[in-house]
Interface confidence: low
């Protein structure tokens, strides 16, 4: 807390400008009107305040807006956002994607902080669903964002948003999350032709059921081993040797290297040895 002291004569701030960087903390508190600060937040843009001075500016805004800052102020917070606590952010009503982007930029290159997580939560709840533009923005800043959501939260992602998802966005997703995302992806990409469809659906296949894998095996897709190894074990087990051969195409030889790992190991144990021998890979059931 900064003590309440009278502003020295002639030091009352008439606008937010660079002269303020020479003010001591108590002078900022006494001489800068909070309403002026709020209306000229964008002017703070290029002023090299110290972090201690930023604390004073935050304190002034907190006093002016005890119920939470308006979006016109939030959009121009910049580095002041790094001073906010999750409790502060929970009071906000952020509806503009531009505001969200401006604040995410400030934290860019860092792990998702509790402040950012709270901000995103407030924003998404305010919108009611993870629409495409929001998802596009969030995954651009945090590629792992999608996989940090619970299956319940993912259920609010509309299929149209799936177009914004890149393969790397799904790297850390577990099977339960892919179970939710896969049907949405199938719906999103349903009008694409075979080869294009497979390119798009490939990263979601960890949520695919057996019937879909069987259908893919009829389309000369040449699935790579990395994708095959991420498939659900229960979806792979019912596939025949012929179906797996068709599904993998030239990559079928990779099964030998993966024979001790799931789902290949479990699948091998389910097959007749005669069928496995047709692959000529020396796989032992």
């Amino acid at each position: 807390e900064v003590e309440k002291t009278a502003c020295p004569s002639g030091k009352k701030a008439r606008e937010i400008d660079e002269s303020l960087i020479f003010y001591k903390k108590w002078e900022l508190e006494a001489c800068v009107d909070a309403a002026l600060l709020a209306t000229q937040m964008d002017r703070v843009n290029a002023i090299p305040f110290t972090y201690e001075q930023l604390d004073v500016l935050k304190h002034k805004l907190d006093e002016l807006y005890p119920q939470g800052y308006p979006e016109s102020v939030i959009q121009h917070l910049g580095y002041l956002f790094l001073k906010m606590s999750p409790e502060d952010i929970r009071k906000w009503n952020v509806t503009s994607l531009e505001t969200l982007k401006a604040l995410l930029e400030v934290n860019k290159g860092h792990e998702m902080s509790p402040q950012v997580a709270t901000l995103i939560d407030r924003f998404v709840k305010g919108r009611g669903q993870l629409d495409k533009d929001t998802l596009d923005t969030l995954t651009a800043f945090y590629p792992g964002y999608l996989c940090s959501l619970s299956p319940e939260e993912l259920s609010s992602v509309p299929p149209s948003s799936i177009w914004a998802v890149r393969p790397q966005d799904l790297d850390t997703c577990d099977p339960r999350q892919l179970d939710v995302l896969y049907p949405k992806a199938r719906l999103a990409f349903q009008n694409m032709n075979g080869s294009e469809y497979f390119v798009k659906i490939q990263s979601f296949l960890g949520g695919a059921p057996t019937e879909d894998l069987k259908a893919l095996s009829q389309q000369n897709v040449s699935m790579d081993l990395a994708t095959f190894m991420k498939l659900r074990t229960d979806a792979v087990l019912p596939l025949t040797v012929a179906e797996v051969q068709k599904l993998l195409g030239p990559h079928v030889e990779g099964l030998k290297a993966e024979e001790r790992h799931r789902p290949v190991r479990d699948w091998i144990l389910r097959q007749r040895q005669d069928d496995l021998d047709t692959l000529g890979l020396g796989l032992q059931g």
Epitope: M41, A46, L77, A102
Partner: nanobody, 126 residues
Framework: QVRLVESGGGSVQAGGSLRLSCAAS????????MGWFRQAPGKEREAVAG????????YYADSVKDRFTISQDNAKNTVYLQMNSLKPEDTAMYYC???????????????????WGQGTQVTVSS
């Protein structure tokens, strides 16, 4: 991806001048602050001067005020550092840096720098 390429370093006598250039390529959208840090052998990397590229507002470390001038050429996406009255203590590797400045162009710490150049050596002899 942003790439920063410095040039203009070299050796000079005390009291002399040098002009460093930093050309940025790639999507600079959002990285509003560009400028220079330096690192002398065995010392921490420190901010020298920065500029808010849209507005031309500047930041200088106390040690270089009134001697160094930072400027920009928006058309060329290039930032310049004019160094006059050079002193032996200005000897260091000078690095161009780009960092995001949404509200505060606080160029004084390297923590929030997103991109660095490879560096250009400046040597000032007495």
């Amino acid at each position: 991806q942003v790439r920063l390429v410095e040039s203009g370093g070299g050796s000079v006598q005390a009291g002399g001048s040098l002009r460093l250039s930093c050309a940025a390529s790639g999507d600079m959208n959002g990285y509003k602050c560009m400028g220079w840090f330096r690192q002398a052998p065995g010392k921490e990397r420190e901010a020298v001067a920065g500029i808010y590229t849209g507005r031309g507002t500047t930041y200088y470390a106390d040690s270089v005020k009134d001697r160094f001038t930072i400027s920009q050429d928006n058309a060329k996406n290039t930032v310049y550092l004019q160094m006059n009255s050079l002193k032996p203590e200005d000897t260091a590797m000078y690095y161009c840096a780009a960092k995001y400045c949404a509200v505060v162009a606080e160029f004084g710490g390297p923590r929030l720098v997103r991109y660095w150049g490879q560096g250009t050596q400046v040597t000032v002899s007495s």
